[in-house]
């Protein structure tokens, strides 16, 4: 679950930056891809590839884009309205209990076991005992968040809460 957004998650805008488009709030809210100015009079655009906002909002700052870690691939780039989608590289996975890095999937099952589940970005291969059918590794939960590396932002399986 994402933590409360803190100052470092927000991307302060330079008010004087000429490339930032301004418009007026509609009923006190600014459209996706913008945040509201401190005086509440203007909507200031987020910076493409740097920060974003997803909804009509009265945020004083746009949210900072997630950067994919090494070992992750970028499935979808950060835009002014959507955060980055990152995912563990093929052949690696990220577990709930070790979310800090993508780990290599096993190449095969131990002797006496058979593979019943492939390597995915969220789980190692799944092996069961040939006779009993009992699992060697824990089951993946039914629903999880898109994972993003930064709090308050979903990212890909590796870093989104999808």
């Amino acid at each position: 679950e994402s933590a409360l957004i803190t100052q470092q998650d927000l991307a302060p805008q330079q008010r004087a930056a000429p490339q930032q488009k301004r418009s007026s709030p509609s009923e006190g809210l600014c459209p996706p891809g913008h945040h509201i100015s401190e005086d509440g009079r203007d909507c200031i655009s987020c910076k493409y590839g740097q920060d974003y906002s997803t909804h009509w909002n009265d945020l004083l700052f746009c949210l900072r884009c997630t950067r994919c870690d090494s070992g992750e691939v970028e499935l979808s780039p950060c835009t002014t309205t959507r955060n980055t989608v990152c995912q563990c590289e093929e052949g690696t996975f990220r577990e709930e209990d070790s979310p800090e890095m993508c780990r290599k999937c096993r190449t095969g099952c131990p002797r006496g076991m058979v593979k019943v589940g492939d390597c995915t970005p969220w789980s190692d291969i799944e092996c069961v005992h040939k006779e009993s059918g009992t699992k060697h590794s824990g089951e993946v939960p039914a629903v999880e968040e898109t994972v993003t590396s930064s709090p308050g932002t979903p990212a890909s399986p590796c870093s989104l809460s999808g």
């Epitope: 679950e1 994402s2 933590a3 409360l4 957004i5 803190t6 998650d9 006190g28 809210l29 996706p32 974003y52 997803t54 909804h55 009509w56 909002n57 009265d58 949210l63 997630t66 499935l75 979808s76 835009t79 309205t81 959507r82 955060n83 980055t84 989608v85 629903v143 968040e145 898109t146 993003t148 709090p151 308050g152 932002t153 979903p154 990212a155 989104l160 809460s161 999808g162």
Partner: antibody
Framework: QVQLQESGPGLVKPSQTLSLTCTVS??????????WSWIRQHPGKGLEWIGY???????YYNPSLKSRVTISVDTSKNQFSLKLSSVTAADTAVYYC????????????WGQGILVTVSS | DIQMTQSPSSLSASVGDRVTITCRAS??????LGWFQQKPGKAPKRLIY???SLQRGVPSRFSGSGSGTEFTLTISSLQPEDFTTYFC?????????FGQGTKVEIK
Amino acid sequence: QVQLQESGPGLVKPSQTLSLTCTVSGGSISSGGHYWSWIRQHPGKGLEWIGYIYYSGSAYYNPSLKSRVTISVDTSKNQFSLKLSSVTAADTAVYYCARDDSSGWGFDYWGQGILVTVSS
Amino acid sequence: DIQMTQSPSSLSASVGDRVTITCRASQGLRNDLGWFQQKPGKAPKRLIYAASSLQRGVPSRFSGSGSGTEFTLTISSLQPEDFTTYFCLQHNSFPWTFGQGTKVEIK
């Protein structure tokens, strides 16, 4: 794991106000970046997005329902609520609450829904 | 509003079959589209986000593709638990809108 649960009366009389509450467990409604929505599904039909609210209290509504809808939030109870005024039989539907994921990729968690019938 | 046209509205298939469901948008969405599974009396469950990214914990037999105005959900090999309803959601522009749903039934 985040869970959402809708509650409220299952029967509302025409012209009255429909009131529903969504209780969030397994996570804070104030956690940054998430917006909290109401959606409804008329019997045998598709889904309709009603509106959302942020923990700060700022809300945005579907223009088709805006004149009748109010969504509010109570962070101390980890709840958000829907009020729909001047209801008619056409407002009979299953009402869902849902959470938008914080990266802008749509709803990641939903409640199981509550059927509200408008009838005298 | 963006109109989402989902097809087919229903289909009959057998366990092991490959199934494809389509959503067409009345205007371009980039990749701002999700796919959901809805079982009777249960909370809808997200399968795919960002048009093609698989939700954590969702079996890899589910996949999504497309961008712009045409999107597909594919189930590569239907399992008994997959016989239910699926719908798409566009979240490119407000108000967000949904496909009408596709009911996957046992042949």
